[in-house]
């Protein structure tokens, strides 16, 4: 014998209290597959979370983070504070990248500038807190007759480490 509940489509549930007829999911609940005996409560985008996609009778709500935060975790289960470019997030909040490191995003950690000399190249444009260095051709390639390159930005004082 076929289970009568198997005929209940997504967006409904098989209601045991009403001779296993297919009843629509109540408000704020959903069933994403057929043959369900209950509908699930929708995820609630509350507090730091805001609704990206409303719940429907056949699909769950989707959340993202309020401005100033970005999603972490599966399905945006957490929100992490944004920082400015040139900063990284620490336990005590946003901190400027130390000299010799950069971050060109609002999230993530400060990363060391590229070491151009490892590739036998010269620094074409100095790095900043927000941008990596730009490596140019190797010093040997810069013959006296070669076309000029963009002058590097003024370097910061060695050892300067803003906090």
């Amino acid at each position: 014998l076929q289970d009568p509940c198997s005929n209940c489509p997504a967006g409904t549930f098989c209601d045991n209290n009403r001779n296993q007829i297919c009843s629509p999911c109540p408000p704020n609940s959903f069933s994403s597959a057929g043959g369900q005996r209950t509908c699930d409560i929708c995820r609630q985008c509350k507090g730091v979370f805001r609704t990206r996609k409303e719940c429907s009778s056949t699909s769950n709500a989707e959340c993202d983070c309020t401005p100033g935060f970005h999603c972490l975790g599966a399905g945006c289960s957490m929100c992490e504070q944004d920082c400015k470019q040139g900063q990284e997030l620490t336990k005590k909040g946003c901190k400027d990248c130390c000299f010799g490191t950069f971050n060109d995003q609002k999230r993530g950690i400060c990363r060391p500038w590229t070491n151009c000399s490892l590739d036998g190249k010269s620094v074409l444009v100095n790095g900043t807190k927000e941008r990596d260095v730009v490596c140019g051709p190797s010093p040997a390639d810069l013959s006296p007759g070669a076309s000029s390159v963009t002058p590097p930005a003024p370097a910061r004082e060695p050892g300067h480490s803003p906090q």
Epitope: G47, V48, T66, F69, S77, C79, L89, G93
Partner: antibody, heavy 123, light 106 residues
């Protein structure tokens, strides 16, 4: 350092009301993303979430207690409040104030708790 | 409402034991689950958030796993200071707590 200090507990008559306070320090109740709520624990019983208010002043209540609860805050005093009306013996509990999320990652958990304030409902 | 059922409600264990506590949700809640430790007369202390993330300062012998409806808190090697009551809490829809698992000395 984040600190939450509850006050306002004590002996209350059945049918009466109480207003609990939670003084917050080390963060602002109006900082984006922050939510602060109330959780209680009757003697020897489970933890029960009651209410939460977020930085945008959105309020959330336990469905079973919604009609008797009011959560509010005073940003100038950085203080959270809970009003509970029509008190019954079963409202006797330690009432905790707790902040949602951790330091830089915020979600639906409570990383910081006050020490609690005991409310006894008895005639 | 979403209910959380913890098991066992209490257990006896010895120092050095591996302890596992389970929390079952009445429906799928993704990874929106936290674990707390509470000692008598004290406020709960957050151990694990988002099912498996260890809160800063919590010893690495504590770990959390699971998603959907079934979650586990594991203490890999029980220490004297770990005898306490442990609670799970969901934040998928409003907030609810399990009723606790008391870990006692055998």
């Amino acid at each position: 350092e984040v600190q939450l200090v509850e006050s306002g507990g004590g002996l209350v008559q059945p049918g009466g009301s109480l207003r609990l306070s939670c003084a917050a320090s080390g963060f602002s109740l109006s900082t984006g993303g922050v939510g602060v709520g109330w959780i209680r624990q009757a003697p020897g019983k489970c933890l029960e979430w009651l209410a939460l208010i977020d930085w945008a002043d959105d309020k959330y209540y336990s469905p079973s207690l919604k009609s008797r609860l009011t959560i509010s805050r005073d940003n100038s005093k950085n203080t959270l409040y809970l009003q509970l009306n029509s008190l019954r013996a079963e409202d006797t509990a330690v009432y905790y104030c707790a902040r949602g999320g951790s330091d830089t990652v915020i979600g639906d958990w409570f990383a910081y708790w006050g020490q609690g304030t005991l409310v006894t409902v008895s005639s | 409402d979403i209910q959380l059922t913890q098991s066992p409600s209490s257990l006896s264990a010895s120092v050095g034991d591996r302890v596992t506590i389970t929390c079952r949700a009445s429906q799928s809640i993704g990874s929106y689950l936290a674990w707390y430790q509470q000692k008598p007369g004290k406020a709960p202390k957050l151990l694990i958030y988002d099912a498996s993330n260890l809160e800063t300062g919590v010893p690495s012998r504590f770990s959390g796993s699971g998603s959907g409806t079934d979650f586990t808190l594991t203490i890999s090697s029980l220490q004297p200071e770990d005898f306490a009551t442990y609670y799970c809490q969901q934040g998928y829809y409003l907030w609810t707590f399990g009723c606790g698992t008391k870990v006692e000395i055998k």
